[in-house]
Interface confidence: medium
């Protein structure tokens, strides 16, 4: 098994067991030792080994560290002399006692955690052991503590979440690979509360969004919508412009590894019969001789419940992409769970997914990140083989993706039905543009123009920012009674005609409100078209209207250069 | 930022005690950890002890083992190292350090003081 340096593994043909010492070794004779041969190594031998791979700076195949760490039976000594990454797969009970157990986890905090997937044995008894050790009791964690857990704190479960969030949000912010259920719920939580490091969701800026990064995808709906709507759109477009968060490009199988596994034969008695936990003892080039394609084909739902590291799924993919050149069935597909990730968008290109329990099953991997390349291609795939965007659809995307509909172009919304437009929540509609929502408001007003007036307004309200002017007048009608924050987000050119008495009407309660909006738009441009007295009568201050004796002339261009109405005066 | 600062560095008799203090001020929550070092005309620095806030589990370099007792006052933000049967090769200047981490590493240490002198004459 070839490393990250890039050397090649030389056959040991049984070296190990008889050099006139093992450090003598060559980078290479050590880098493609076989478990099969360490198994027959004394425990000195072993150690010996372990030793001379961590002063060649050696980096080896996590089915090798496996194996080296089940054969050093006894606590090592020197543990600073060993590969920094075996001490991971290491029992922290043999080193007990608060001498012994400092040692080793000053070192272990230092390893690249992430060799084990999150669900890995290995990897789920370091966490408790490292807090015993460092002496945490309860779940208050200072910044300290912390630091000292290295990569063991993305592993912190939610209660630690919850009573430290202040000195751990920032540290899952950096966490690679996806947090789990508890700690997303968690996370949402203590956002939400708006307390240290971020403040209320109402008080943050760009660099606060910056600042969240990794945790952004955990943010419910009910927080994004308390962010200012502003900040949102200035962070998306310089989100969208910075290729810093651009996600790389899953791995697909390099050309290396192709030649590294074909034609090896399946040593005997290791045939798979099933696929169940005995192959994550499986190097890649058994799991590619020893596992039918057929098999794992059929078996695709077991494939989750197994911990396989990733270079494994990588070898389950590349059966199944020899299996499917054309594209996987969508039986398959459905059950590919987490090997989704692995998926390019070429991959995906190839598949017809007509089932919706498909794609929920697929969004459901995704579930708590942002929209990848990915999913992306999988919904286009899906909604084009669908023909249009229909109310089921609808429904489950936007439950996986809030801001699904507004992510579509103008052009791609008109291919949506009046009939699917009942699915839309408010919050589905956060992120839209004047131009999306001028295409959604006239589906609306047909989708609900059989409710009554009260009923109706609720439904409509959330599309209102496509609404015109007309429209607008019919509703000041009605005692709707409109919300501020509703009327800001109407068309500007939709709300210059209307008259105080009509806007007074519209707003009821609310009108109010103008006063503290009286500098933005569009109240500010429709204060302007306001003669001053009829603004007077509404007893709120409102200054800026015209003077009376005046005349408006609707000159309309010399408007459109100055953005105020032409005056003649007395 | 931590501010530390070292004190009770003086000559003392071969076999005498000596007690060194260091005060720690600023913000004291992001570290975890305190270690005192010392560094001999011409040596390197050397490890001593190291004390951590969690538990206040102490842990002592072999050639202090059994005369060296790291303790901490949490009341007035001080560490001390009482050092007993005094050699003259524990001459050297004393420095106290903090920071973050299990405290093997000297990279575990981002904060530290000045020193003081220990001086044991023979």
């Known amino acids: 098994l070839a490393g990250e340096t890039g050397q090649e593994a030389a056959p040991l043909d049984g070296v190990l067991a008889n050099p006139p010492n093992i450090s003598s070794l060559s980078p290479r004779q050590l880098l493609g030792f076989p478990c099969a041969e360490v198994s027959g190594l004394s425990t000195e031998r072993v150690r010996e080994l372990a030793v001379a791979l961590a002063q060649k700076n050696v980096k080896l195949s996590t089915e090798q560290l496996r194996c080296l760490a089940h054969r050093l039976s006894e606590p090592p000594e020197d543990l600073d002399a060993l590969p920094l990454d075996l001490l991971l797969f290491l029992n922290p009970d043999a080193f007990s006692g608060p001498q012994a157990c400092t040692r080793f986890f000053s070192r272990i905090t230092k390893a690249n955690v992430d060799l084990l997937p999150r669900g890995a044995p290995e990897r789920q008894r370091l966490l408790p052991a490292a807090l015993a050790c460092w002496g945490v009791r309860g779940s208050l964690l200072s910044e300290a503590d912390v630091r000292a857990l290295g990569g063991l704190a993305c592993d912190l479960p939610g209660r630690f979440v919850a009573e430290s969030a202040e000195v751990l949000l920032p540290r899952l912010v950096s966490c690679p690979g996806p947090l789990d259920q508890d700690q997303q719920e968690a996370a949402r939580a203590a956002l939400q509360g708006g307390g240290p490091p971020y403040g209320p969701p109402s008080t943050w800026s760009v660099s606060t969004m910056d600042a969240l990064r990794g945790l952004l995808p955990v943010l419910g709906q009910p927080i994004i919508r308390s962010i200012p709507q502003g900040i949102v759109a200035a962070w998306r477009q310089r989100s969208s412009r910075d290729p810093s968060w651009r996600q790389p490009e899953r791995t697909i199988l390099r050309p290396r590894f192709r030649r590294e596994v074909e034609k090896t034969a399946c040593p005997s008695g290791k045939k798979a019969r099933e696929i169940d936990e005995s192959l994550i003892f499986y190097k890649k080039w058994e799991l590619e001789a020893c596992v039918d394609a057929a098999l794992l084909a059929t078996q695709m739902d077991r494939v989750n419940a197994i911990p396989f590291t990733y270079e494994q799924l990588d070898v389950l993919k590349h059966k199944l992409d020899e299996l499917y050149p054309q594209g996987y069935p969508e039986s398959v597909i459905q059950h590919l769970g987490y090997l989704f990730l692995k998926m390019s968008p070429e991959d995906i290109r190839k598949w017809n997914v007509t089932s919706l329990e498909t794609l929920k099953a697929l969004l459901e991997v995704n579930k708590g990140h942002e929209m990848s390349p990915q999913v992306a291609t999988l919904i286009d795939r899906f909604v084009k083989g669908r023909g249009q965007l229909d109310k089921d659809t609808l429904d489950t995307l936007t439950a996986f993706y809030p801001g699904y509909l507004c992510s579509l172009s103008p052009e791609e919304l008109s291919s949506v039905p009046p009939s699917s437009i009942w699915a839309v929540r408010p919050q589905d509609l956060d992120t839209c543009d004047p131009r999306q929502l001028d295409v959604l408001y006239p589906k609306a007003r047909l989708a609900f123009q059989n409710m009554n007036g009260s009923e109706y307004f609720v439904k409509i309200q959330s599309f209102l920012g496509g609404a015109p002017t007309e429209d607008l007048k019919a509703l000041s009608q009605q005692n709707v009674s409109m919300d501020l924050a509703t009327f800001m987000k109407l068309r500007t050119d939709a709300v210059l005609p209307l008259t105080v008495a009509e806007v007074q009407k519209l707003l009821g309660p609310h009108v109010e409100g103008l006063k503290a909006e009286e500098r933005h738009r569009p109240v500010r441009d429709w204060i302007l078209r306001q003669r001053q007295d009829d603004l007077d009568t509404l007893g709120l201050g409102l200054q800026g209207g015209i003077p009376n004796g005046y005349l408006v002339l609707d000159l309309s261009m010399q408007e459109a250069l100055s953005g105020t109405p032409c005056l003649l005066g007395p | 930022q931590v501010h530390l600062v070292e004190a009770g560095g003086g000559l003392v008799q071969a076999g005498g005690s000596l007690r060194v203090s260091c005060a720690i001020s600023?913000?004291?929550?992001?570290?975890?950890?305190l270690g005192w070092f010392r560094r001999a005309p011409g040596k390197e620095r050397e490890f001593v002890a190291l004390i951590r806030w969690s538990n206040n589990y102490a842990w002592y370099e072999d050639s202090a083992k059994g005369r060296f007792t790291i303790s901490r006052d949490n009341a007035k933000n001080t560490v001390y190292l009482q050092m007993n049967s005094l050699k003259p090769e524990d001459t050297a200047v004393y420095y106290c350090?903090?920071?973050?981490?299990?405290?093997?590493?000297?990279?575990?240490?981002?904060?530290w003081g000045q020193g003081t002198q220990v001086t044991v004459s023979g």
């Open positions: 350090a903090a920071g973050t981490g299990w405290g093997f590493s000297i990279s575990d240490y981002n904060y």
């Open positions: 600023g913000r004291t929550d992001s570290t975890g950890i």
